[in-house]
């Protein structure tokens, strides 16, 4: 038994036929010693007398609000809730399995940008006697603060004969660092109470994995002379992280009729305009995705082909233009070839995802993961890789990126990747290895040597363990190269001569 909040206790029960249950001793919160009686809920039946009451809790009939009285006056309450465990698994009766992206997904979370603000939601078919409380932190062993609001009913839907209720909560990381590479996941814990049943649900994620931008805004059409083609332009959503030269998006533009089965024109672009073929009765739609990290696509923003107006009002800085001042020359160091670094780092992003695209959909986090990933160098908040830090002195950040590149290059050349199951030299991992080396050489000025970190002795003995470790390393590398690509894109846009 443990205390959920003041005067509310959770009794954990193994739930099977003829289970012995749990013996619980309740103590009346009073200095009085004599003449104390106990009742349960609204019943006037006296269950016992004395300052303590010992009960055997086996089923929901044994749970509820226990009250101690003296001479018709209430002294204190203790609310007992039950938390069922069947076959070693805690019950999940209150929330509905959303089955996306995988089975046993009860909580789903999304973030519109890298500010540390995110929203989680869950579904239930229960309409009454239901309360939720939400807690969150970054990391679990040495948790950093995340503040969550109250959960609210956000939508009601009819699903067949049932009504489905959606609850949501907004959370904000207390000291968010949008430009840093996350090393510890956000943990979200939801306590759910329905009548006398207690359940808890958890989710663990990196903000980068739950990013879903808002749709592009201000879609505009401009027909091209003597052509079937139309130029469509749009702007970054207002909620996306800035500057856009650092936090860049990529876009998918599609022309399609009302039915999904109809023919379509489709193209991908990093710009904020594209040329497409518009058909009568069709619509042009545009959606956005983080350019350097394969998180979710936004919903579509659409405008009909017939109208050459805009889909939504609103102005604002469009495109991925840098804005702001130029980065000044690096004191005591030479500037890198920003544009070359940008191209190579973007290639690294693509290779990191093609080296094992499945990695993006596998949950590789497990017990002891914080220890495994602690050995890997992360681009942290103080490393100067944010836009302001790059403006002040990009050398600190470039040194950090260089260290990381060398570290991963060594890892990819180590026994973890060269051992069984074997990879061919020109596999995506082979190409990734070569590109890491290429970018690190571009960054390393002649005759200037930066300190590099030793690679940890991680090599496992079993092939399956090696495979799992590869996936974890690649997953971590995907995050690292995304930050590096943002740095070089911003540098190319704002520093390159």
């Amino acid at each position: 038994i443990w205390e959920l909040k003041k005067d509310v206790y959770v009794v954990e029960l193994d739930w099977y036929p003829d289970a012995p249950g749990e013996m619980v001793v309740l103590t009346c919160d009073t200095p009085e010693e004599d003449g104390i009686t106990w009742t349960l809920d609204q019943s006037s039946e006296v269950l016992g007398s004395g300052k303590t009451l010992t009960i055997q809790v086996k089923e929901f009939g044994d749970a509820g609000q226990y009250t101690c009285h003296k001479g018709g006056e209430v002294l204190s309450h203790s609310l007992l809730l039950l938390h069922k465990k069947e076959d070693g698994i805690w019950s999940t009766d209150i929330l509905k399995d959303q089955k996306e992206p995988k089975n046993k997904t009860f909580l789903r979370c999304e973030a519109k940008n890298y500010s540390g603000r995110f929203t989680c939601w869950w579904l239930t078919t229960i309409s009454t006697d239901l309360t939720f409380s939400v807690k969150s932190s970054r990391g679990s062993s040495d948790p950093q603060g995340v503040t969550c609001g109250a959960a609210t009913l956000s939508a009601e839907r009819v699903r067949g004969d049932n009504k489905e209720y959606e609850y949501s909560v907004e959370c904000q990381e207390d000291s968010a660092c949008p430009a840093a590479e996350e090393s510890l996941p956000i943990e979200v814990m939801v306590d759910a109470v329905h009548k006398l049943k207690y359940e808890n649900y958890t989710s663990s994620f990196f903000i980068r994995d739950i990013i879903k931008p808002d749709p592009p805004k201000n879609l505009q059409l401009k027909p091209l002379k003597n052509s079937r083609q139309v130029e469509v332009s749009w702007e970054y959503p207002d909620t996306w992280s800035t500057p856009h030269s650092y936090f860049s998006l990529t876009f998918c533009v599609q022309v399609q009729g009302k039915s999904k089965r109809e023919k379509k024109d489709r193209a991908f672009t990093d710009k904020t305009s594209a040329t497409v073929i518009c058909r009568k009765n069709a619509s042009i739609s545009v959606r956005a995705q983080d350019r350097y990290y394969s998180s979710s696509w936004s919903e579509w923003a659409s405008v009909p082909c017939s109208g050459s107006g805009s889909s939504r009002g609103g102005s604002g800085s469009g495109g991925s233009g840098g804005g702001g001042s130029k980065l000044r020359a690096v004191p005591g160091g030479s500037s890198p070839a920003w544009t070359q670094c940008q191209q190579l780092s973007q290639k690294l992003c693509t290779l990191a995802w093609s080296a094992h695209p499945l990695v993006g959909h596998m949950d590789l986090r497990e017990e002891g993961d914080e220890e495994t990933t602690n050995d890997v160098p992360h681009i942290q908040c103080g490393d100067g890789c944010d836009p302001q830090g790059l403006r002040d002195n990009s050398q600190f950040c470039l040194q950090r990126i260089h260290q990381g590149l060398i570290f991963y290059e060594k890892l990819l050349g180590s026994d973890i990747f060269t051992g069984e199951p074997s990879l061919l030299p020109d596999s995506p991992v082979g190409q990734l290895h070569a590109s890491l080396l290429g970018l690190s050489q571009l960054l390393q000025p002649e005759g200037h040597h930066w300190e590099t970190q030793q690679i940890p002795s991680l090599s496992p003995s079993q092939p399956w363990q090696r495979l799992l470790l590869r996936f974890k390393i690649l997953r971590s590398l995907q995050a690292f190269v995304a930050v590096a690509a943002r740095v070089f894109a911003h540098g190319a846009a704002t520093l390159s001569p």
């Epitope: 089965r261 109809e262 023919k263 379509k264 489709r266 193209a267 093609s354 695209p357």
Partner: antibody, heavy 118, light 107 residues
Amino acid sequence: QVQLVQSGAEVKKPGASVKVSCKASGYTFTDYYLHWVRQAPGQGLEWMGWIDPENGDTEYAPKFQGRVTMTTDTSTSTAYMELRSLRSDDTAVYYCNANKELRYFDVWGQGTMVTVSS
Amino acid sequence: EIVMTQSPATLSVSPGERATLSCRASQSISINLHWYQQKPGQAPRLLIYFASQSISGIPARFSGSGSGTEFTLTISSLQSEDFAVYYCQQSNSFPLTFGGGTKVEIK
């Protein structure tokens, strides 16, 4: 399944015109874009243009503009490509292909060899 | 127009080996890149669309990667039926253009 059957080989004199046909089956004719791509002997592939059978809209590669005409007959589910003012370097296999997506080529016809020779 | 360059022009590979074919665009084309296989006397066949998307019915040994200006088609373990000419095609802008092709031949 979606199938495209093209007309037979043609031999033409320089300056003449050729009209190649492409009969579609296995799908609703107006649901797919139709493209024409050619391939000179021993050479690579060259895109000529597309037509939307639903409305007759066309887009031609600049190289063929003014010399090519693409048409369709929805009653017979047939597409046509006419190339005028033939030259010897127009000798090639001409392919029609269909796709629900405009910008790449999914289902191909078997090809029609057009030889331009005096 | 966008010029597509494929390399090498000819690739000699033994059956069972891996083949890596390259395609470069004269300007950035995002992931608007598609791969085709053509055997002698046959029409081309679509293998990969939008740089890395696989087609149902195409063996899993064919995979594509890349974005921007550099793209790769990888055949993980060449089978006898894979010896053919491979073309890349950009769909970033009209006119649609193809690379010159890479002939994969038996070593």
